[in-house]
Amino acid sequence: GWVWNQFFVPEEMNTTSHHVGRLRSDLDNGNNSFQYKLLGAGAGSTFIIDERTGDIYAIEKLDREERSLYILRAQVIDITTGRAVEPESEFVIKVSDINDNEPKFLDEPYEAIVPEMSPEGTLVIQVTASDADDPSSGNNARLLYSLLQGQPYFSVEPTTGVIRISSKMDRELQDEYWVIIQAKDMIGQPGALSGTTSVLIKLSDVNDNKPIFKESLYRLTVSESAPTGTSIGTIMAYDNDIGENAEMDYSIEEDDSQTFDIITNHETQEGIVILKKKVNFEHQNHYGIRAKVKNHHVDKQLMKYHTEASTTFIKIQVEDVDEPPLFLLPYYIFEIFEETPQGSFVGVVSATDPDNRKSPIRYSITRSKVFNIDDNGTITTTNSLDREISAWYNLSITATEKYNIEQISSIPVYVQVLNINDHAPEFSQYYESYVCENAGSGQVIQTISAVDRDESIEEHHFYFNLSVEDTNSSSFTIIDNQDNTAVILTNRTGFNLQEEPIFYISILIADNGIPSLTSTNTLTIHVCDCDDSGSTQTCQYQELMLSMGFKTE
């Protein structure tokens, strides 16, 4: 049978041939009658065999990490017979390891993110090195990790390569760290090989900083003419945190006047001071408000960093604007009786300069020929007024500052012309009446009514009478209906068209004014030749024809 031991050949041997071992048959008595042969991958190139003795030699340098074992076949032949002495047999040559490979970090580059202010012991990342040497061969591939750079903030577990935090870090002081880790094989013993890697450790932000105002005092100005909602300026705080942790909200902490507000521009992180109520330089020309700023998002566990909000004081100066004169009233209503002489007093308007300098005021009336106004605001008439022509006047009074004629205010002034009883009542229309020749006594000829151009505080009441001469010798009489109408009646029987074709009756109409006014109104009554029915219609028709130049039979 075959006789051999386990074959080992150390890697990386520099000699030209290295004796590996000897293959032999137990039938070989050493008389050189046997021939040994080597077959398989590596036979003849890497390994050779002494055909006579069966000694095997490695003829080139081996690398275990490239190939750790060779499987070869051995044959032995009897030279005299040419026959196989032993059956062909497989055997193994193992390449034994030497520590010729340093540890390598194959997953480079390493980058980790860890929240700032993380406590000691917080896991950051695990780095792992690989050693191509044989892990089962002594300590060639047994690694130990150590920190070359990164103290005192980081530590590495020697056997696992786990990097942990060893000291709290503040991102606002330094936001990233380069840590250098070394891996040594041979568990760090002399002759060990080493490899290093760099780990970039970035600190993520936590909200451990409150916003703080850049200035302890801001000075802003606002014009007294500024409307509510006007932005009058900006204030700004800074926050050393980033992103969402630096988002802030501004608010008013103190503004007794409740005149201002602060809104936050979330894009620029500025506070915008807004006018909430109009200001008046003459009332108050400066304001002080206190503003505060807080982060928008604060986690409960970080509240300790946000106990007292940063505040700032804002001095706001109101800028004076030359304002137009201010009338005491938004409008005026005056009354004056009609028929008062020109130059009569109507009323007084008053405007003042609201500014501190108190400019004198000049007054004027826009487009009026009836009224005048002086520099004291006294309105007088330039003509006598007639209520029956115009009962109301709508005036526009203008006040102008003497020192700045561009500062003008106008208000409406309404003048009511009050009635006096200066008009007597008169017929409401022209009356033309007709009476038949054959009319009987007491026949109604005409109903009349009156109008009075005067205004009556109460109802007008008119009194109707015939004139004295008509009363004494009249063929007609009048009855007052007590409702501002009266009826004219015949006072005799029969009339004669030839003798008296027309009657002119004077009617007195008096009003109930104080004093009472009376007018004389003439009623024309035509005598007509009527048919048997007593109708005056034909008479009226005849009158119409005559007036048009026609003659009737």
């Epitope: 302890s216 000075r219 100005t221 007794d256 006047s257 003459e282 304001y287 002080g288 100066q317």
Partner: antibody, heavy 119, light 107 residues
Framework: QVQLVESGGGVVQPGRSLRLSCAAS????????MHWVRQAPGKGLEWVAV????????YYADSVKGRFTISRDTSKNTLYLQMNSLRAEDTAVYYC????????????WGQGTLVSVSS | EIVLTQSPGTLSLSPGERATLSCRAS???????LAWYHQRPGQAPRLLIY???SRATGIPDRFSGSGSGTDFALTISSLEPEDFAVYYC????????FGQGTKVEIK
């Protein structure tokens, strides 16, 4: 320490002019609004004028408006009051005063300079 | 303008006594914008109280201010010899105006 020193007072005839100065030291002059206040002999205090910290705004009492001008030179840390068309009633000790940073009261005053207007 | 009226015109007291000075405004003084000063003969005024009740730097706590709106007061709890002077109130709500002063004299 904060110091304000007025100068430029004296006797002047009515209608003439005078310029008062106030030298400031011991604080950042350019950060404070500054005022002039006067006190007629045996009388109370009367505010005269104010100028803003940056010199952009000035306000005056009605009694001096149009006649007095307040100004400042930050490079010299000096406040001025130019008084024109002086009247007898302008006779007073003139004080310069610093306005409080967080308020509008006057926390520091100079020792004053006397202006006498008489013929 | 806001007119300040101080009363009394003169206050005659002894050292150690309590002094109460009054200042009344013709219209409401916004945000308690009122200050008190004292002035010794031949000297410049000195700020005692601002904001109606806040003591200025270096002012002893025997001085206290109170009030709001139109009625304000300065109280000196126990008069010291150096407290005998003229006291002025000043409003700075609308421009700056002073009261006519109250003289605190030794009785």
């Amino acid at each position: 320490q904060v110091q304000l020193v007025e100068s430029g007072g004296g006797v002047v005839q009515p209608g003439r002019s005078l310029r008062l100065s106030c030298a400031a030291s011991g604080f950042t002059f350019s950060s404070y609004d500054m005022h002039w206040v006067r006190q007629a002999p045996g009388k109370g205090l009367e505010w005269v004028a104010v100028i803003s910290y940056d010199g952009t705004n000035e306000y005056y009492a009605d009694s001096v408006k149009g006649r007095f001008t307040i100004s400042r030179d930050t490079s010299k840390n000096t406040l001025y009051l130019q008084m024109n068309s002086l009247r007898a009633e302008d006779t007073a000790v003139y004080y310069c005063a610093r306005e409080r940073y967080f308020d509008w009261s006057f926390d520091y005053w100079g020792q004053g300079t006397l202006v006498s207007v008489s013929s | 303008e806001i007119v300040l009226t101080q009363s009394p015109g003169t206050l005659s007291l002894s050292p150690g006594e309590r002094a109460t000075l009054s200042c009344r405004a013709s219209q409401s003084v916004s945000n308690t914008y009122l200050a008190w000063y004292h002035q010794r003969p031949g000297q410049a005024p000195r700020l005692l109280i601002y904001g109606a009740s806040s003591r200025a730097t270096g002012i002893p706590d025997r001085f206290s201010g109170s009030g709001s709106g139109t009625d304000f007061a300065l109280t000196i709890s126990s008069l010291e010899p150096e407290d005998f002077a003229v006291y002025y109130c000043q409003q700075y709500s609308n421009s700056w105006t002073f009261g006519q002063g109250t003289k605190v004299e030794i009785k």
